[in-house]
Amino acid sequence: RKIPKVGHTFFQKPESCPPVPGGSMKLDIGIINENQRVSMSRNIESRSTSPWNYTVTWDPNRYPSEVVQAQCRNLGCINAQGKEDISMNSVPIQQETLVVRRKHQGCSVSFQLEKVLVTVGCTCVTPVIHHVQHH
Amino acid sequence: RKIPKVGHTFFQKPESCPPVPGGSMKLDIGIINENQRVSMSRNIESRSTSPWNYTVTWDPNRYPSEVVQAQCRNLGCINAQGKEDISMNSVPIQQETLVVRRKHQGCSVSFQLEKVLVTVGCTCVTPVIHHVQHH
């Protein structure tokens, strides 16, 4: 789902207050609800009728350092006989998410938010076909 | 997918540098790749064999203010005849994501990262049946 543009108003102080110095803000250490965990069905990526594989990207200057991307294994979906049926389609489900980028020069460390598009998994859909008009 | 625990090392300065004052860091204004957009299939939530609905939660002190949660519509999956087949299961696909929480007291504004569990959509899976041993 889409993350709306900030318009930077979210990060501004109220109008009656002095502006933020040097275009930066105070980010408190620690993460709220850090212990919260995904409780997804086991092996969902293999048991799905639109199965997918995972690829892990790793970047030490990003939090989280690991970002996992899914790729649909098939064009079609897997039917009850375990065969691929191309009358249906495996399509990716995407999510916009935030990560934190770390930037440092010597002892000066700052952080910036970054938007990342993550493919979370795949789902099986009925195809939609548009007729191309001939004039 | 899971976001690993910070262990707070990510947000610390190198050991040879003076520590961060007051338990906060510098967060630069602006979002990298802010214009990046999800290019998901139209009406994917209705066309899926494991369809879902969306619920929007809104919080003005969170960025993004809108967080969209999916809920699977069915226990089973929709078959070629448009009927629910309970020999298969619609299951949620979850993703851990970061949001930014704004905290203010008068003109003092600070921000903190928060982990949120988002259900992004649903997929159709073959059920797993575990045999319960009798002693």
Partner: nanobody
């Protein structure tokens, strides 16, 4: 403007062969997955074959697997379907189709104009 024009259909006896062609224009043909679909009298569209942009990955419906071969010539912006061992149940109007979006699978497609009629009868 996207155009997909099918040709090569006709009347053929059971066991016979035909080669269908699709001439594509108005888009970067070599970047798109391409498909053959068909519609038998009184029935819905049936997806019968798919081919990746580079021609590497091929998919066939079970009903045609082993009898039909999909191919493409990116230099000529053309898609082909070689149909062998034809059966009466292959009687249909055949259309070529392309992905609606390039580079991202959405399960949405564009298909061409009139299609080409294939009739298998003795």
């Amino acid at each position: 403007e996207v155009q997909l024009v099918e040709s090569g259909g006709g009347l053929v006896q059971p066991g016979g062969s035909l080669r269908l062609s699709c001439a594509a224009s108005g888009f970067t043909f070599s970047s798109y997955w391409m498909y053959w679909v068909r519609q038998a009298p009184g029935k819905g569209l049936e997806w019968i074959s798919a081919l990746a942009p580079g021609g590497g990955n091929r998919y066939y419906a079970e009903s045609v697997n082993g009898r039909f071969t999909i191919s493409r010539d990116n230099a000529k912006n053309s898609l082909y379907l070689q149909m062998n061992s034809l059966k009466s149940e292959d009687t249909a109007v055949y259309y070529c189709a392309k992905d609606h979006n390039v580079g991202y699978r959405t399960g949405e497609y564009d298909y061409g104009g009139q299609g080409t009629q294939v009739t298998v009868s003795s």
